[in-house]
């Protein structure tokens, strides 16, 4: 039992705070924001993690065509409502009263509405589109090496099981990666598309959520895989709920 | 290397209340637990409570509330266990240990005798 | 409160014999198990926790398995100095809760 086992720390999230207080010295993490228990064996919700990032101080053609139903996060950061799981609440409220209903990654899929506004289900987001534009390269990457390296990260880094990436597409300079995972198809256990696509998007901007991990270093075939623009496409399993003059605008 | 001290044995009238210590040396006496168990003669092992002196938040078992208290020094690296209105079960040798992810350094033992 | 039904409550054994305890949770308890070994007069030992870590200076011989809510110690060849208690202990939640021990003698 040596000192380095010694360390109560949450690898899998930097927002929290740890001690060694839990059952027989259980080392137990709580999200900062929240106040909520993590499992550090896993990653932490989005919702959570969201929550935290709120709380901290601030500082400083192969390709697949979005759905129309497709969303993007355009409304960026807020304070999120979270369940006892650490899941988001359907629906979302600012201070000033305005409410709105979100889908299972936390993105505003109804026009936004007063206390009265109802959002009767957590809506799942079943499909993501991660785009990706890498900066300029000597050549193209191989396109079955840059395949196994994202389905390897995805894996390994994120614990993603390999059957949600359901395809990586490359037209150099774009690449794009397709998460699926149905609720039928979700076990126990399993980590959800949209935590680990927030995980990837974190990372790619050199934000990492990782305790003492170095930032992400891709590399396909030792060629640095450098991104240069990310574009998440959000796909629920029930069309959002949008009035015509935001469709048209 | 990590040791707990234990004070020594106890003999006390039925009624009355004893205070026991567990010195630690050896590592940082806040970053860890410090558990209390119980062994009856002939029997088994219990457990007492807990107490991580790095916060001063504690846990009891709920058959020793009003029965056990558990303080901690950190200024003197001691945790102690107050026992109240003894009875001859309370008999029983006393053992402190530092736990840390179920792993535990055990003290050498503090034995409590209630007789009248 | 989570009970821990620990088997046998006694037993001999040979020396060099394979030597199994078990313990048995009345819920899952996600691997949070330790093993104790407690000898007359002396302090309890850690031999494993989390199910199955051996503690850094524990002879080899002694491997912990398990998960949910079944768990054994197993001694794979049995040695003068084994005799004595064995305790399991659960840490999933508060309070803890030992087995009610296995009294290991040599036959």
């Known amino acids: 039992h040596t000192a380095a086992q010694d360390n109560c720390t949450c690898p899998t999230n930097k927002m929290t705070v740890c001690s060694p207080d839990g059952p027989g010295g259980r080392c137990q993490c709580r999200a900062l924001g929240s106040g909520m228990a993590v499992d550090c064996s896993t990653l932490t919700s989005k919702c959570l993690l969201l929550k935290a990032r709120m709380s901290a101080p601030k500082n400083a053609r192969t390709l697949v065509r979005p759905s129309e139903h497709a969303l993007v996060d355009n409304d960026g950061l807020y304070d999120p409502d979270c369940d006892p799981e650490g899941r988001f609440k359907a629906r979302q409220c600012n201070q000033t009263s305005v409410c709105w209903c979100v889908n299972s990654v936390g993105v505003r899929r109804t026009d936004k509405g007063d206390l009265s506004l109802r959002c009767d289900e957590l809506v799942r987001t079943h499909h993501i589109l991660i785009d990706l534009r890498h900066r300029p390269t000597a050549g193209a990457f191989n396109h079955s090496d840059l395949d196994a390296e994202l389905r390897r990260l995805f894996r390994e880094r994120y614990r993603l099981h390999p059957k949600f990436v359901a395809a990586v597409h490359y037209e150099q300079p774009t690449i794009q990666i397709e998460l699926r995972q149905n609720t039928s198809q979700k076990a126990a256990g399993d980590v959800d598309i949209g935590d680990a696509a927030y995980y990837f998007e974190r990372d790619i901007k050199g934000e990492s959520l990782f305790q003492g991990r170095g930032g992400l270093d891709l590399r396909v075939r030792g060629e640095p895989l450098q991104v240069e623009r990310t574009l998440i496409y959000y796909l629920d399993e029930i069309p959002p709920k949008f009035s015509m003059k935001r469709l048209t605008a | 290397q990590v040791q707990l001290q234990q004070s020594g044995p106890e003999v006390v009238k039925p009624g009355a209340s004893v205070k026991m210590s567990c010195k630690a040396s050896?590592?940082?006496?806040?970053?860890?637990?410090i558990n209390w168990v119980k062994q009856r003669s002939g029997q088994g092992l219990e457990w007492i409570g807990q107490?991580?002196?790095?916060?001063?938040?504690?846990h009891y078992n709920k058959n020793f509330k009003g029965k056990a208290t558990l303080t901690a020094d950190k200024s003197s690296n001691t945790a102690y266990m107050q026992l109240n209105s003894l009875t001859s079960e309370d008999s029983a040798v006393y053992f402190c240990?530092?736990?840390?992810?179920?792993?535990?350094?055990w003290g050498q033992g503090t034995l409590v005798t209630v007789s009248a | 409160d989570i009970k821990m039904t620990q088997s046998p409550s006694s037993m001999y054994a040979f020396l060099g014999e394979r030597v199994t305890i078990t313990c048995k949770a009345s819920?899952?308890?996600?691997?949070?198990l330790s093993w104790f070994h407690l000898k007359p007069g002396k302090s309890p030992k850690s031999l494993i926790y989390?199910?199955?870590r051996l503690v850094d200076g524990v002879p080899s011989r002694f491997s912990g398995s398990g998960s949910g809510q079944d768990y054994s110690l197993t001694i794979s060849s049995l040695d003068y100095e084994d005799v004595g208690i064995y305790y399991c202990?659960?840490?999933?939640?508060?309070?803890?809760?030992f087995g009610g021990g296995t009294k290991l003698e040599l036959k």
């Open positions: 819920q899952g308890i996600n691997n949070y």
């Open positions: 202990l659960q840490y999933d939640e508060f309070p803890l809760t």
């Open positions: 050896g590592y940082r006496f806040t970053d860890y637990v």
């Open positions: 107490i991580y002196p790095g916060s001063d938040t504690f």
């Open positions: 989390r199910a199955n």
């Open positions: 240990a530092r736990f840390f992810e179920g792993f535990a350094y």
